[in-house]
Interface confidence: low
């Protein structure tokens, strides 16, 4: 009967997704998939002693064991507000509602006599209302609320007398409600009833420490279920034609070492000791798992052969619960030293392998939020998205027969040992209110959408387009700071003397007096690492190369008193040698990469960008670079990502905004200097590059998140773009937001006030828009106190684990770049835009498929922006040429200069100018586009040193 679930952990342990479809499936669920929502009677009904209801073991437990909780009475009051529950179900559009019957509400002392009329009326009304709405009821007979009288009289589930009493109760329910109920659950999560009720004492009746009692209770629960199944099968199924099962709950677990047989064995033991304890007898061979029998010996009761036959096969489908109750508290779990995991897909695979591919109803799934979270339960959306995506993959990719899904729970309510400290509802209920209104949370809206679409539709993207970028498009690659070689590596032609060797037989060199030869002038190829750069660039087939100068190397003292001519010569060589290969340079003057900011030491010690003298020093440095390199360089970036640099000055918001102000002025002065002194002769263009990730609301159902997404863009991009591209001043939205927080005493930050002269200085000091775009961030509003830039924005980020992302958690969201480009054009007008850095880190050292996927998808979106949105996109610079050791692997080349396969991919993209249709020929002449010539590459590699 039983299979072996161990194979689940032997699947590719090192699998890393490299495209979206491997991680997240945009697809629909099967046609008649059963969508539902669930509640437990004790959790939501309230009215614990109203209208003749008897007390349950949980009512007693709450009074005796739970601190600060007087009763379950507050709850959501479903017993009183049935109509409100029905409206909530209507809102979501479910196909079924899973609820439990409160045994003591029907039979106050547990024994089946005449049913309590008011209780009976409640359940009849509920069932009739569901049938009227075409909502299928799934009814649980026992969700932990045993009549207290049975506990006190018999010792509860420890006593096998309860088996027959439970069967009587079930018989009554089948007789009374069976005409309207086609799906029955006998017991909800018997593992927790036994383990926490009698082992840890965390659940009612709160007994603990007696392991024999735990397994006796488990034994009686199995026998009770089995008896009820046979009862239904014999007496009710023939005319009611329903199905009956038991809901079994479990965690999931992953081995510490995926290749380690012992760790996998421990994972198997962990699953068997929880899920297998009940599933093996019921869904397997009728007996407990061998491992449990060996380990527990006399503690575990025995099934006789007759009982095994009786128990085996007593479930018409596999009802599976996967939620927080099986994951807490961690210290009571059967982890066996391995790692608990929320991978529902793997758990379903284990059930498929272990129990012969049964039909599965997910009878409980969901997570929880803190009690203070009201309707904006953003994390709940992502948990649901993740779980549902795993279920969909299990169905579509693993061929697991899941036929229904129960989101848990319909309402906030009483959460067992956590009482009212957590919430699990799709609907928010204020427990202190009289009317107990059910307010849909974001997760309710999300689930409603899932049900309406029967899954996940891909509505984020416009279909791919075929087309090409313009012929003068800059196909570039970006490198960070190039450290100049301080000494040319090959000075062999700088000695003017002639030598004779071994003239006297002493094997020495003798200088010939009176003879002086012409020395070879210094050559660019004297620098070894320029040769390396050129080799890599030639293989990239790019038209443009963006790199940064090292300010501290060019001007070690920070001023023009000590110019490092060798460094300037090195940089001139990089540019001129590149030009020989048809590769133009985009040169960045200042590219801070480290906490030391890349400033000359004296400037750093004087306060760095908090000191206005750094501004003057930068202008002088820029002038020097324009003068020395400007005849060869036509594209300049003054400062790379000043909007990121400023967060180093994060002692206070005022430091941040002060540093940013000085960076803006430094850029503007450099631009004005170029405009005035160098543009007439050099005819170049100057800008600064901004870090420009796109932002989306983490919760699309929350207005505050939409506002937070726009605010992120204002604080991140507009902060620098507005003064330079548009008004000469900081964005009004940013200024107002900070001022408002200041007024409310939440922050002492203030944006600097700009004089008219400063506004005139800043405004219009860009010749093009340069954006560094890597990813899209999911942002949410969270009011943060404090006077730092980070807290001034009131923004937190959310990582969507269902999204494809890189090792450093950069999400691959191609459509974000198109949205960004459209936003920039809408806000700052029709201007030339260069994407000056864009890329992803990819662990692969050779076949970097994630990078290829990223390039293809992001460039496709840039092309849409160009062709459909008419954005004047002038160039795309992939980041970056070579990776640095011990850093995330963003490079096309490894740190020891080995080429990765994405290079060929980028080559192809460049040679075809984008995504041409099958029959279109290249529109661009070879003179307009750089092509790699084999001889050139050979010469570059073989140039003498």
């Amino acid at each position: 009967f039983s299979g072996d679930g161990r194979a689940v952990w032997s699947k590719n342990p090192n699998f890393t997704p490299v495209n979206e479809s491997q991680l997240f499936l945009y697809d629909t669920f099967p046609k008649n998939f059963f969508w539902g929502v669930g509640t437990g009677a004790l959790q939501v009904e309230g009215s614990w002693k109203k209208d003749g209801k008897g007390p349950s073991i949980w009512d007693h437990f709450v009074h005796t064991h739970l601190k600060n909780v007087s009763s379950t009475n507050g709850s959501s009051d479903s017993y009183i507000f049935l109509e409100k529950d029905l409206s909530a179900l209507d809102f979501i559009g479910v196909s079924f509602y899973q609820f439990s019957i409160s045994w003591p509400r029907l039979f106050p002392d547990g024994i089946v006599t005449v049913a309590n009329a008011k209780g009976l009326q409640y359940y009849n009304t509920l069932l009739d209302s569901l049938v009227l709405r075409n909502i299928e009821p799934i009814v649980t007979l026992y969700h932990w609320d045993l009549p207290l009288a049975l506990q006190e009289k018999y010792g509860g589930w420890k006593n096998d007398t309860i088996i027959d009493i439970f069967n009587d109760y079930a018989t009554y329910c089948f007789q009374t409600f069976g005409d309207r109920v086609k799906y029955w659950i006998t017991i909800h999560n018997p593992y927790l009833v036994a383990w926490h009720g009698y082992g840890t004492g965390m659940h009612a009746p709160g007994e603990k420490g007696n392991l024999a009692a735990v397994y006796t209770v488990g034994h009686n629960l199995i026998k009770a279920h089995s008896k009820v199944w046979h009862n239904y099968n014999t007496h009710f199924r023939p005319h009611q034609k329903g199905w009956l099962s038991i809901t079994l709950g479990s965690h999931w677990i992953e081995p510490n070492r995926s290749e380690n047989t012992m760790d996998i064995l421990k994972c198997q033991q962990s699953m068997v000791s929880v899920l297998g304890w009940f599933a093996s007898p019921i869904h397997g061979d009728g007996d407990y798992p061998e491992g449990m029998k060996k380990k527990l010996l006399s503690i575990l009761p025995l099934f006789s052969e007759a009982e095994k036959n009786e128990v085996r096969g007593t479930a018409d489908f596999f009802a599976f619960s996967f939620g927080p109750n099986n994951f807490k508290p961690l210290n009571t779990m059967a982890k066996m030293g391995q790692n608990v995991s929320l991978n529902l897909r793997e758990a379903l695979n284990w059930i498929k392998l272990e129990y012969n591919n049964p039909q599965i109803l997910i009878a409980e799934n969901g997570w929880f939020t803190d009690s203070h979270v009201k309707t904006e339960d953003t994390t709940a959306i992502y948990m649901m998205k993740n779980f549902l995506s795993q279920v969909l993959q299990a169905i579509r990719l693993d061929e697991i027969r899941v036929f229904g899904y129960t989101a848990w729970s319909l309402l906030d309510g009483f959460e067992w040992q956590d009482a009212y400290t957590i919430r699990r509802g799709l609907f928010y209920v204020d427990f202190n209110s009289k009317q107990k209104e059910r307010k849909p949370k974001s997760s309710a809206h999300y689930y409603k959408q899932i049900i309406r679409e029967n899954g996940f539709s891909l509505k984020e993207a416009t279909p791919d387009v075929q087309g090409q970028f313009p012929c003068d498009f800059s196909w570039g690659v970006t490198e960070s700071v190039l450290k100049p070689e301080s000494v040319a590596s090959s000075p062999q032609f700088s000695d003017p003397y002639l030598y004779v060797w071994n003239a006297t037989g002493n094997r020495l060199l003798h200088r010939v007096e009176g003879v002086r030869l012409k020395t070879r002038p210094a050559q660019c190829t004297d620098f070894v690492n320029i040769k390396k750069q050129l080799e890599m660039l030639a293989r990239m087939k790019v038209t443009h190369y963006r790199f940064a100068l090292d300010w501290a190397s060019v001007l070690p003292t920070g001023n023009l008193s000590a110019v490092n001519r060798q460094a300037l010569r090195y940089y001139r060589c990089v540019v001129s040698e590149g030009l020989k290969l048809g590769i133009s340079a985009m040169v960045t003057l200042y590219y801070p990469t480290h906490a030391h900011l890349g400033l000359p030491e004296p400037l750093l010690h004087a306060g760095g960008w908090l000191n206005p003298s750094t501004v003057e020093a930068f202008q002088a440095y820029a002038g020097l670079c324009f003068q020395e390199l400007g005849d060869l360089v036509k594209l300049w970036i003054t400062i790379n990502e000043p909007n990121r640099l400023s967060d180093i000055y994060n002692r206070s918001g005022n430091d941040t905004y002060g540093a940013a102000h000085n960076l803006l002025v430094a850029h503007a002065l450099a631009w004005r200097l170029y405009d005035r002194q160098f543009r007439p002769s050099q005819r170049g263009a100057v800008s600064l590059s901004l870090h420009a990730d796109w932002a989306e609301p983490a919760n699309p159902y929350a207005d505050s998140h939409w506002r937070a997404a726009e605010r992120f863009l204002q604080f991140e991009i507009a902060w620098f773009a507005e003064p330079l591209f548009k008004t000469g001043d900081y964005p009004a939205a940013m200024r107002e937001y900070i001022a408002s927080k200041h007024r409310r005493g939440l922050s002492s930050s203030a944006l600097p006030r700009l004089t008219e002269a400063e506004r005139r200085l800043l405004k219009g000091t860009v010749d093009f828009c340069a954006l560094n775009h890597f990813t899209t961030r999911f942002v949410m509003h969270e009011q943060l106190a404090g006077s730092r830039y980070d807290s001034d924005r009131d923004i937190q980020f959310l990582q969507d684990i269902t999204r494809l992302s890189s090792p450093t958690r950069l999400a691959v969201i191609p459509w974000g770049v198109r949205k960004l480009l459209r936003w920039v054009r809408r806000n700052y007008g029709d201007m030339d835009i260069y994407i000056t850095a864009s890329g992803i880190d990819d662990q692969a050292l050779e076949d970097d498929r994630l990078r290829k996927y990223y390039l293809e998808k992001y460039l496709q979106e840039v092309l849409k922006a160009y062709l459909i949105d008419k954005v004047r996109i002038k160039g795309y610079y992939a980041f970056k040429l070579a990776e640095e050791k011990s850093k995330p692997r963003f490079g096309f080349f490894t740190s020891d200069f080995k080429a990765k396969s994405s290079i060929q991919f980028y080559n192809k993209m460049i040679s075809s100018s984008g995504f041409p249709s099958e029959n279109s020929s290249s529109r661009c002449s070879q003179t307009q586009k750089n092509t790699e010539c084999t001889v050139c590459l050979f010469l570059v590699q073989k140039k003498p040193l």
């Epitope: 906490a595 990121r644 967060d647 994060n650 730092r788 450093t808 011990s886 850093k887």
Partner: antibody, heavy 124, light 109 residues
């Protein structure tokens, strides 16, 4: 300027749980470039890394002590807390917290500022 | 997990150059950071990313890293340089910080 200050009990009994707090100032625990590590040093012995918490709340623990450690942060209080269960006399040491700088939001650049350390003795 | 090996002690006369090594499998492909710790004090970062110096650290401190050995070099050693020195890397495979066992630098005389 940037400072970190450790606080916690001086004396702990065997089997008890140690809770240490690192209060930071001069930088934000939200800042994408900042992370905080806990390191300890038994008397006369080498530094031993215990745990690290990144700005995005990701956590990393020393393999040998993983089952006993929990690191967390409270950004609003500018505090990082380390909890170490089941203390033993061999855990007697000076416990340091240190800021680690990452650049570009992702790269690890060493621990540039350390607290002065708090000495914890485990004895019955 | 990744292991870093340092010599327990290094002695050097004032004014001379001290070299402290840190061995590790292919350590050249890792970024190495060096800390100085004087008795009774907390460690101080003296070199990061193989060879970069934080501001305030004298130019006498330099670092290099290739192959299986990283080296901290202290030129023109002074009595005040006497301390324990630790190398450290971030092991990206396990997301763990790894310290070397430390080297005691003694300044003779």
């Amino acid at each position: 300027q940037v400072t970190l200050k450790e606080s916690g009990p001086v004396l702990v009994k065997p089997t008890e749980t140690l809770t240490l707090t690192c209060t930071v100032s001069g930088f934000s625990l939200n800042n994408a470039r900042m992370g905080v590590s806990w390191i300890r040093q038994p008397p006369g012995k080498a530094l031993e890394w215990l745990a690290h918490i990144f700005s995005n709340d990701e956590k990393s623990y020393s393999t040998s002590l993983k089952s006993r450690l929990t690191i967390s942060k409270d950004t609003s209080k500018s505090q990082v807390v380390l909890i170490m269960t089941n203390m033993d006399p061999v855990d007697t040491a000076t416990y340091y917290c240190a800021r680690s700088v990452v650049t570009g939001g992702y790269y690890y650049d060493g621990m540039d500022v350390w607290g002065q350390g708090t000495t914890v003795t485990v004895s019955s | 997990s990744y292991v870093l090996t340092q010599p327990p002690s290094v002695s050097v006369a004032p004014g001379q150059t001290a070299r402290i090594t840190c061995g590790g499998n292919n350590i050249g492909s890792e970024s190495v950071h060096w800390y100085q710790q004087k008795p009774g004090q907390a460690p101080v970062l003296v070199v990061y990313d193989d060879s970069d110096r934080p501001s305030g650290i004298p130019e006498r401190f330099s670092g290099s890293n290739s192959g299986n050995t990283a080296t901290l070099t202290i030129s023109r050693v002074e009595a005040g340089d006497e301390a324990d020195y630790y190398c450290q890397v971030w092991d990206g495979n396990s997301d763990h910080v790894v310290f070397g066992g430390g080297t005691k630098l003694t300044v003779l005389g």
